[in-house]
């Protein structure tokens, strides 16, 4: 965990000082240093550092929480409050946002940004594609065309003088339209199915 707080073990102790002298403060444990010729080391409780565990650590200043997690130093413990989509003591685990998140009615789960969303099949909407979409809600038929919901989408019944899937093309007085080429058998005023 190179991104986290440095090792809480203190530095090698002063020469001539042994563990019997009680050099480790704040609950630190003295390791080694049985005699004046061998150096001791202090293992410091979380929240303290220094050769004798004499320094209080501002552990949050080292930004131990990954992926935008919020750091909380509780004194005896460090907590990371993770953003959605991340977990672990240091928010180090990127959750599979789509795991166990089925999108209904043929929708496809799309991961990203620590969250998931569903790309819904035509005719469905909502967070999990469970809602039947009203394709006419957005008033897709232009120039006063009337919208009809259809199992495969919507159908526009165009007002006189307009044509096209969304009634977007005016019909000229001579019978020509702004369409590049109308499909054969399609007359102005016929319902235009939008697929």
């Amino acid at each position: 965990y190179p991104y986290d707080v440095p090792d809480y073990a203190g530095m090698l102790g002063s020469s001539g000082v042994t563990c019997a002298d009680g050099p480790c403060f704040n609950g630190g444990l003295c390791v080694g240093g049985a005699d004046p010729d061998s150096a001791y080391i202090c293992h410091c409780p979380p929240g303290f550092q220094g050769s004798n565990c004499e320094k209080r650590v501002d552990r949050c200043s080292l930004q131990p929480c990954r992926n935008g997690g919020l750091c909380l130093d509780l004194g005896h413990a460090l907590r990371c409050r993770c953003r959605a989509g991340f977990a672990g003591p240091r928010c180090e685990h990127d959750l599979d946002d789509c795991a166990g998140r089925a999108c209904a009615n043929g929708g496809t789960c799309v991961e990203g940004g620590g969250a998931h969303r569903c790309s819904c099949a035509l005719g469905f909407g909502g967070r999990d594609c469970r809602e039947r979409a009203d394709p006419c809600a957005a008033r897709p038929c232009a120039h006063g065309g009337r919208c009809y919901a259809h199992f495969s989408g919507l159908v526009c019944a165009c007002a006189p003088g307009y044509m096209g899937a969304r009634c977007e093309f005016p019909v000229h007085p001579d019978g020509a339209s702004a369409l590049p080429a109308a499909p054969p058998g399609l007359r102005p005023g016929d319902p235009q199915r939008y697929l």
Epitope: G27, H43, P46
Partner: antibody, heavy 118, light 108 residues
């Protein structure tokens, strides 16, 4: 309140390696040192080793050559391995959390009995 | 290593009486880094006292600890039925961490 649960085989053959795992019930594994302690039947307590997630470890010199302690933060677990076991290693093995102020033990697992027999 | 010797090995008392348990170290326990534990049969030890005299969370005030250097004492002012158990001292000033051999407090 955090809870600790030891797991591993209750029976080990002489000369084999004993492997035990302790599962921590919450995400506090990075906040504390974690330790193993054992107690032979009818006898006192013996500290084995401790570990901190940064990599700091410390072992009882009487067991150091045979003991390995490790930690897996992703699983909220730490483990003990004791090699070349003999009948003298039969004991209740406890995992414990090291107190936040000094190396006493404030939370203990319920213990798991390990028998050494062929 | 620091060797801790507990005495007496067994203490026979009645409920309501005062219990005094001793823990003596082979060398000075630095910074009064000494703890006491209670263990009932078939259960894990429970931390009672740390820093020689500080009660752990949830420990009744009938338990008290004292001492420094090499001599430490655990006192139970009035024994309750649930206090009959084995008590261990532990030093955590110098590695290796060591425990005493225990004192059994039994009903007389």
């Amino acid at each position: 309140q955090v809870q600790l649960q030891e797991s591993g085989p209750g029976l080990v053959k002489p000369s084999e390696t004993l492997s035990l795992t302790c599962t921590v019930s919450d995400n506090s594994i990075s906040n504390y040192y974690w330790s193993w302690i054992r107690q032979p039947p009818g006898k006192g307590l013996e500290w084995i080793a401790y570990i901190y997630y940064s990599g700091t470890t410390n072992y009882n010199p009487s067991l150091k050559s045979r003991v390995t302690i490790s930690l897996d933060t992703s699983k909220n677990q730490f483990s003990l391995q004791l090699s070349s076991v003999t009948a003298a290693d039969a004991a209740v093995y406890y995992c414990a959390r090291v107190f936040h102020w000094g190396f006493a033990f404030d939370i203990w697992g319920q213990g798991t009995m390990v028998t050494v027999s062929s | 290593e620091i060797v801790l010797t507990q005495s007496p090995g067994t203490l026979s008392l009645s409920p309501g009486e005062r219990a005094t348990l001793s823990c003596r170290a082979s060398q000075r326990v630095s910074n009064t880094y000494l703890a006491w534990y209670q263990q009932n049969p078939g259960q894990a030890p429970r931390l009672l006292i740390y820093g020689a005299s500080s009660r752990a969370t949830g420990i009744p005030d009938r338990f008290s600890g004292s001492g420094s250097g090499t001599d430490f004492t655990l006192t139970i002012s009035r024994l309750e039925p649930e206090d009959f158990a084995v008590y261990y001292c532990q030093q955590y000033g110098t590695s290796p961490l060591t425990f005493g051999g225990g004192t059994k407090v039994e009903i007389k």
